[in-house]
């Protein structure tokens, strides 16, 4: 059974992940990002189901495409460092989902824009955090 310290650690990691995802969303969904209209033509794959930490496998598999799209947005008005940011997210995701369990991600039929994709995973983090508190 999870101890209170492990639950606290999970909660902190989820909060960190949530902040990173929100930072990306705020960074791209900004009139100072003239590349947004181009970024929206890229599609992302959404999880069929995202209710448990193991479902973060679906996020992990989309991190490389996310980094590629974020690279488009780099400019003097846009201060995200895609490689560092995605690397940090990857570390958190690996810790949260655990590396010992092999979970095959199932994707929904409908794809999503980068904004819809980020909102989906932000909602996921908020939902899991609320069950831990």
């Amino acid at each position: 059974a999870p101890t209170s310290s492990s639950t606290k650690k999970t909660q902190l990691q989820l909060e960190h992940l949530l902040l990173d995802l929100q930072m990306i969303l705020n960074g791209i969904n900004n009139y100072k990002n003239p590349k947004l209209t181009r970024m929206l033509t890229f599609k992302f794959y959404m999880p069929k189901k995202a209710t448990e930490l193991k479902h973060l496998q679906c996020l992990e598999e989309e991190l490389k495409p996310l980094e590629e799209v974020l690279n488009l947005a780099q400019s003097k008005n846009f201060h995200l460092r895609p490689r560092d940011l995605i690397s940090n997210i990857n570390v958190i995701v690996l810790e949260l989902k655990g590396s010992e369990t092999t979970f095959m991600c199932e994707y929904a039929d409908e794809t999503a824009t980068i904004v819809e994709f980020l909102n989906r995973w932000i909602t996921f983090c908020q939902s899991i955090i609320s069950t831990l508190t």
Partner: antibody, heavy 125, light 108 residues
Framework: EVQLVQSGAEVKKPGASVKVSCKAS????????ISWVRQAPGQGLEWMGW????????NYAQKLQGRVTMTTDTSTSTAYMELRSLRSDDTAVYYC??????????????????WGQGTLVTVSS | SYELTQPPSVSVSPGQTARITCSGD??????AYWYQQKSGQAPVMVIY???KRPPGIPERFSGSSSGTMATLTITGAQVEDEADYYC???????????FGGGTKLTVL
Amino acid sequence: EVQLVQSGAEVKKPGASVKVSCKASGYTFTSYGISWVRQAPGQGLEWMGWISAYNGNTNYAQKLQGRVTMTTDTSTSTAYMELRSLRSDDTAVYYCARDLYSLYYYDSSGKFDYWGQGTLVTVSS
Amino acid sequence: SYELTQPPSVSVSPGQTARITCSGDALPRKFAYWYQQKSGQAPVMVIYEDSKRPPGIPERFSGSSSGTMATLTITGAQVEDEADYYCYSTDSGGDVSVFGGGTKLTVL
């Protein structure tokens, strides 16, 4: 109501230039880009390029690079497309079209596009 | 330069299902958009982001995408659906847009 109104038909000689205008109304001009698309008689649609009305950034189709220039005048909410060194195969209907997406993602009208009525440019000696 | 490939023509009888395909190497990661163009008119978008339908477009129009292929489906095609259909997308970098060659749909 969003409208894009283009300038009238033009007849030009080979080697000349043409400048087509596209006046936008019914929305915040600088929140969207404008694409230009042409269609030769009996042919398909050809994307020519795009300009951001926000900052003037442009992307042009490779085959037209060097011959086409797209500009905007934000004071009159007008986009312009100039094509130089005209050839007979530039004879086409030229359309301007508002970008599908706004710079502000949550602008509810963002994803539904609007096109001008088209401008016929005839290149003939 | 990036290309989108469509069949030149598709024919169906009224009430049948018409499927128009569009293939392009970047489509696994780039959305497809579909335009209908009737003779002498400006194009009208019937599907955006692979499968979404703009307001005012009949429910019989639907879109899907799998791998390098996007598909426009007209379920129960009607005579007024006779038109040229173009897929549209961008290259893998997102800057260069391109239309497919177009498909003439005949409903007879």
